[in-house]
Interface confidence: low
Amino acid sequence: SAPGEDEECGRVRDFVAKLANNTHQHVFDDLRGSVSLSWVGDSTGVILVLTTFHVPLVIMTFGQSKLYRSEDYGKNFKDITDLINNTFIRTEFGMAIGPENSGKVVLTAEVSGGSRGGRIFRSSDFAKNFVQTDLPFHPLTQMMYSPQNSDYLLALSTENGLWVSKNFGGKWEEIHKAVCLAKWGSDNTIFFTTYANGSCKADLGALELWRTSDLGKSFKTIGVKIYSFGLGGRFLFASVMADKDTTRRIHVSTDQGDTWSMAQLPSVGQEQFYSILAANDDMVFMHVDEPGDTGFGTIFTSDDRGIVYSKSLDRHLYTTTGGETDFTNVTSLRGVYITSVLSEDNSIQTMITFDQGGRWTHLRKPENSECDATAKNKNECSLHIHASYSISQKLNVPMAPLSEPNAVGIVIAHGSVGDAISVMVPDVYISDDGGYSWTKMLEGPHYYTILDSGGIIVAIEHSSRPINVIKFSTDEGQCWQTYTFTRDPIYFTGLASEPGARSMNISIWGFTESFLTSQWVSYTIDFKDILERNCEEKDYTIWLAHSTDPEDYEDGCILGYKEQFLRLRKSSVCQNGRDYVVTKQPSICLCSLEDFLCDFGYYRPENDSKCVEQPELKGHDLEFCLYGREEHLTTNGYRKIPGDKCQGGVNPVREVKDLKKKCTSNFLSPEKQNSKSN
């Protein structure tokens, strides 16, 4: 197991006294119900805590909520319930926090049955003050902020109306009726689906997709026969019903729905689904469900237009529509994703890709671990990671995998070592190189979080008993110190730290239970005195990401370039600080066939980097649908991987000719689109 507090581990000096001086308890004057916590802004230290308590009476449920505010990262809280007139806040809508550092907050209140509309409380000064506003409708969804302008809000009503506000919720206007789903796009554009006949459910597959770019002054119908739509990166996707049967296909647009192309993906039937697993401005990961109730499907990765797709991973675990998938973007290293597959014997295995879905492999067995009972060969096995699916199956897994963009290379996850995921109690594993190698970090299940951009990792044992001990590591999980943060143990409910992992404060939430009452309590621990000094240049070391063959001049090349990072030495106990910026130096690589995906009509045989023509298309003209026109493709089978920056080296030729013929297969051709104004 990983070294604990032994001779290999240098202890942090006088840490008990240092942490005791920086541990702040707050007992909330509340009966225990539910508690939700939101951070307002970045690096502001402002936290809002909403506690709610339901008392079920004979004929109705009586509810009470309280609102608390901290402006010092949770060390002290002030009851500000009076600012919202002691109103009961609806927890299902949560606290709608504005984008970036806008300081905007919207709380949706519970109103009595006969009221004309709902009620919200609005703040634009980081919750110092609130304004009560009565709504002309009853909200069905939480208020959604435009990513570009936090004064613009949209919401759906219980009557399926689409309501928009241009002045941060002060005044509302219904811009369309019969709306099923609405989303903000870029440039304050709103996309939404409408039904013409009975309802959203009855018209599924016959919905229309609309767009407004001026907050409801004018509209354009950009799609018909729509089943659903989604936005990912710069792509707009719509699943569209086929003319002749009940199947549907994905269509994609990169110009906000003005023109559409049919994605080269399998069609799906009534019981199947598509799911955008991840998307950025370069490409998209798309899951296509298998026919039947298999619980798995296939991951495809797109080209830069979202049109041509390469098969990435078979038997990808994804239970049902809106169900569970373990697909995880490892944000601490470019190109890395982890997910689960359902193998032929129905066991679940973890797979990892380091090149954005190009190749998937098993996770390397941690050197300090034995293969468990699932392993046929006790010397050969892999690490398998517990994620959403394990949590949904109520395994003893308190947290999903964790990574942070500014804690380069660090991934923390629960897992087991064998041939497949085990239902036994998992341990916690850490990778410091983005998933290439792993080490057992902690025995048994834990809650964990990353502070100070990886300078500190904090963990709390997952236990049904009350706890009063927190563990922390200043060397990326190699060595651990334990700190008793309270004399009286509490029933632990969660760890909270400011999103972005830049903070040095951690809040431990829980409740105390006595004979008559139970109360919410939080302990906020500031680790600033553990990391006594600011990190200097000597505290950092050079690290080449994705390095697997150190002799190769192409070592570290992923998607056409390699990156060298400055990383904190494990032995350095110092503060990265709130202003820490990841230092990286990119370097362009020569192109090889690995930098290209197979073009339309081509595929890669297993264990081969060359793209070969699909047998059924050999000798045929390659024609496919692009922007509603037939295109003729002259290609030698390769197309550069989206986001790949390689230069020189191998350079396959491709050319697309416009055949000036209309596609019969494109249900979203421009002719079928129309515009109207309010």
Epitope: P550, E551, Y553, D555, Q585, I588
Partner: antibody, heavy 123, light 108 residues
Framework: EVQLVESGGGLVKPGGSLRLSCAAS????????MNWVRQAPGKGLEWVSS????????YYADSVKGRFTISRDNAKNSLYLQMNSLRAEDTAVYYC????????????????WGQGTLVTVSS | DIQMTQSPSSVSASVGDRVTITCRAS??????LAWYQQKPGKAPKLLIY???SLQSGVPSRFSGSGSGTDFTLTISSLQPEDFATYYC??????????FGGGTKVEIK
Amino acid sequence: EVQLVESGGGLVKPGGSLRLSCAASGFTFSSYSMNWVRQAPGKGLEWVSSISSSSSYIYYADSVKGRFTISRDNAKNSLYLQMNSLRAEDTAVYYCARDRLGRGYKWNWFDPWGQGTLVTVSS
Amino acid sequence: DIQMTQSPSSVSASVGDRVTITCRASQGIDSWLAWYQQKPGKAPKLLIYAASSLQSGVPSRFSGSGSGTDFTLTISSLQPEDFATYYCQQGNSLPPITFGGGTKVEIK
């Protein structure tokens, strides 16, 4: 002390051959990529060739490709440059240089350098 | 191939002067640039790597800056032992590795 010492230079006729050697000491030779860089009289520096720590990866400048061969013997802590079909424009001081960082970091900063050996190609 | 252009090709300066040498890459090389000092009859010596990182043992009067295509080597207060020729080198991890034409710093 880290040291690189070149040898094998001299006067050779055009079309002739020469083999340069570089003896390394004071560091773990087998962990570093090695390089040859040359400098014509009164001119600037020109990279010639590189070889990875266990000879898996070898690179040449276009001007010498097909004529020069870089090699190494890790057991003897030695680097070599076999030069065939020599031309007048190959006249230069040839330096042996180590990559600044060991295996895993190929950023091509050269440190240290040997003192150089002069190769003169003349009839 | 990436071409490296150094300017000026020579500079005359006195002890105590501030000297600035520039190097331009024909295409962006991020921070993959090194500076070397070479004295007559001697081998080059690494001064700066990764555009601005000072090689250990090099006096702090030498500094480097720049990123992309334009880079600068500055000697804040010229010392007698600094009279030499200075070369920039693009250190992108792909061969060919290319050097600038050199800048000779002479005594005024």
